[in-house]
């Protein structure tokens, strides 16, 4: 059993059928000796007496708040959580696995620069009694600041029968510099609590690895004299490391008709302005790209052919 | 430590076209590393972190470019008092601290260099021939110390007496490719930067 | 299955003209970009240019502006290379080659070898 | 026009053998690089696009890499079947231009 916060702990179980459970001592925070007696949520029937209680947590019927009273006061809580541990594996009910980049991902996190600050967002069907607390820091041993603000319900949307929730929260390295070399890793630590039950939930990565520049802006076309050509201009988005001559970006622009089946244009370049040729009903799009560090690309920014 | 005395090529072109150059051949090699020796810890999660250059050269505070002086976070080393006393950058050229920068990232490819071609010594005597290193990647960290132009003694290839852990070996490998390709990274950053300057 | 189909060797005299033709099937050529490529005896590869079937426009190499026109008819689902002035340096194999994308080629025809005597 | 130069212009080898060819561009072309391949008395096809891109239908054994000026083409473990031409493309800027090509032969 460990302290999560003031008041609630955590209970860490072996989760298989006749488990014998753990055996938890709880101490009423009170200098009161006699007449203590101890409830369960919200209860009455009297579970023991005296400042302490000893219980067997096997299940999460044995979980929950606890309260010790003297003649009618309530003295101190407790609020017992339940971590369960199946064949040796902590359990991952709460988020949903995003399978992206690889399985048992959870948490995604993204960054629009070099700045040290990043966006992690997590998936899950669960709608209530759910609370989130965020930590994080560059490296474990000796751990460096990175502060994170309260995660956030971010979107909700409907995939089959089912309602999926996405929080997200934003954090920011304490002391970054951008053109710095990461030896250390960001490591990111999410506790869930759904009801009774606790799960947590880490993810390790460099900035460099999660970059994902914001989409090129201000695009703008120019059509060539006597040509089916124009020439696509754009700009660095504004979110981008600056300066743009030391954090450099790649760029693709595609020409993409309404149907899969239509002709298309691609080409790669590493000016903010192409020749491309454009087609009735077609619009060009441009995506943006760190150009010595290959992470991913932006999403496209789009503009109509006509 | 006594830098070594700089005439830096006039024409910065040259020396990003070598810098392009590395970056393709470090990442080249990288890969081709992780894909031949997949049965070791060789991604960027699996292995640590390690600096060979670390407390010997500067590359990243030297190279800092003008704007990022008045960030607090990139001024942790003493070396870079001199960018923000000195008004000598704005013209750039051939100025004490571009000097200073290239000096920093000649000495990064000569460590490199030396680590390297001690590695493929040992890599050529294991009987399971497994991997080698890329004559391409070693011809071009040799064309980018000649296009920086410096003149600096050169260091001794280690020569080592005991018998090879080639595991180890290529493990350590592992750790210098990702670390050189970090370094590329960096290294292609300044010379666009100075190239636009 | 994609096939090409590309009209027989041609033996012209100098200044003479030709009509290449170029047939597709398992692909409609309304969908794609047609180029044509020229290869010359030593085996260097000249791009002529594209013509886009949907809408008969065209863009060529500056080289062969004044020596090739491109048509197609989509009725027939065939793309044609006209060669005007013909000398010895058109002495080659034409290949048509249609694209998703009029930046490379996807497909090549099997080629049509022009010969052009003096 | 951008140039395309392609080493070597023969390169011979034996099968089982790893191989690199070279494409030079006279200008950057960033990523807007494609390699064919040219057997005796066939027409060209497409393996690579845009440097790296790998084509269905195509060997594994064909891969691309390079960005810029300088790219290559790597044939790993070369099979008696790879023998012939092999031209890169440019596609930045029309008029698309190929190199003068590599001869894969025998030893």
């Known amino acids: 059993i460990w302290e999560l916060k003031k008041d609630v702990y955590v209970v860490e179980l072996d989760w298989y059928p006749d488990a014998p459970g753990e055996m938890v001592v709880l101490t009423c925070d009170t200098p009161e000796e006699d007449g203590i007696t101890w409830t369960l949520d919200q209860s009455s029937e009297v579970l023991g007496s005296g400042k302490t209680l000893t219980i067997q947590v096997k299940e999460f019927g044995d979980a929950g708040q606890y309260t010790c009273h003297k003649g009618g006061e309530v003295l101190s809580h407790s609020l017992l959580l339940l971590h369960k541990k199946e064949d040796g594996i902590w359990s991952t009910d709460i988020l949903k696995d995003q399978k992206e980049p690889k399985n048992k991902t959870f948490l995604r996190c993204e960054a629009k620069n070099y700045s040290g600050r990043f966006t992690c967002w997590w998936l899950t069907t669960i709608s209530t009694d759910l609370t989130f607390s965020v930590k994080s820091s560059r490296g474990s041993s000796d751990p460096q600041g990175v502060t994170c603000g309260a995660a956030t319900l971010s979107a909700e949307r409907v995939r089959g029968d089912n309602k999926e929730y996405e929080y997200s929260v934003e954090c920011q390295e304490d002391s970054a510099c951008p053109a710095a070399e990461e030896s250390l890793p960001i490591e990111v630590m999410v506790d869930a609590v759904h009801k009774l039950k606790y799960e947590n939930y880490t993810s390790s990565f460099f900035i460099r690895d999660i970059i994902k520049p914001d989409p090129p802006k201000n695009l703008q076309l120019k059509p060539l004299k006597n040509s089916r050509q124009v020439e696509v201009s754009w700009e660095y988005p504004d979110t981008w490391s600056t300066p743009h001559s030391y954090f450099s970006l790649t760029f693709c622009v595609q020409v993409q008709g309404k149907s899969k089946r239509e002709k298309k244009d691609r080409v790669f370049t590493d000016k903010t302005s192409a020749t491309v040729i454009c087609r009735k009903n077609a619009s060009i799009s441009v995506r943006a790209q760190d150009r010595y560090y290959s992470s991913s690309w932006s999403e496209w920014a789009s503009v109509p052919c006509s | 430590r006594n830098l070594p005395v700089a005439t830096p090529d006039p024409g910065m072109f040259p020396c990003l076209h070598h810098s392009q150059n590395l970056l393709r051949a470090v990442s080249n090699m990288l890969q081709k590393a992780r894909q031949t020796l997949e049965f070791y810890p060789c991604t960027s999660e699996e292995i640590d972190h390690e600096d060979i250059t670390k407390d010997k050269t500067s590359t990243v505070e030297a190279c800092l470019p003008l704007e990022l002086t008045k960030n607090e976070s990139c001024l942790n080393s003493r070396e870079t008092s001199f960018i923000t006393n000195g008004s000598c950058l704005a013209s750039r050229k051939t100025s004490f601290m571009m000097a200073l920068c290239l000096s920093s990232i000649y000495e990064d490819l000569k460590m490199y260099q030396v680590e390297f071609k001690t590695m493929n010594a040992k890599l050529l005597m294991d009987p399971k021939r497994q991997i080698f290193l890329d004559q391409n990647m070693l011809a071009v960290i040799d064309e980018l110390m000649q296009a920086l132009n410096f003149n600096s003694e050169t260091v001794p290839q280690k020569s080592s007496l005991e018998e090879p852990d080639f595991y180890k070996t290529k493990i350590k490998l592992c750790i210098l490719l990702h670390a050189f390709r970090i370094r590329a990274v960096t290294i292609d950053r300044v010379m666009s930067y100075l190239n636009a300057s | 299955e994609v096939q090409l189909q590309q009209s027989g060797a041609e033996f012209v005299r100098s200044g003479a003209s030709v009509k290449l033709s170029c047939t597709a099937s398992?692909?409609?050529?309304?969908?794609?970009?047609i180029h044509w490529v020229k290869q010359r005896p030593e085996q260097v590869l000249d791009w002529i240019g594209w013509?886009?079937?949907?809408?008969?426009?065209?863009e060529y190499a500056p080289r062969f502006q004044d020596k090739a026109t491109m048509t197609a008819d989509t009725s027939s689902n065939t793309a044609y290379l006209h060669l005007s002035s013909l000398t010895s340096e058109d002495t080659a194999v034409y290949y048509c080659?249609?694209?998703?994308?009029?930046?490379?080629?996807?497909?090549w025809g099997q080629g049509t070898t022009l010969t052009v005597s003096s | 026009d951008i140039v395309l130069s392609q080493s070597p212009a023969t390169l011979s080898v034996t099968p089982g053998d790893s191989v690199s060819l070279s494409c030079r561009a006279s200008q950057s072309i960033s990523k807007n690089l494609h390699w064919y391949q040219q057997k005796s008395h066939e027409s060209p096809r497409l393996l690579i696009k845009?440097?790296?891109q790998s084509i269905s239908g195509i060997p594994s054994r064909f891969s691309g890499s390079g960005s810029g000026t300088d790219f290559t083409l790597s044939i790993n473990s070369v099979e008696t079947e790879d023998f012939g031409m092999y031209f890169c493309q440019q596609s930045i800027s029309w008029p698309l231009t190929f190199g003068a090509g590599t001869k894969l032969e025998l030893k």
């Open positions: 013509i886009d079937p949907e809408n008969g426009y065209s």
């Open positions: 080659n249609p694209g998703e994308l009029a930046r490379y080629f996807d497909y």
């Open positions: 845009y440097t790296s």
């Open positions: 398992g692909l409609n050529i309304k969908d794609y970009y």
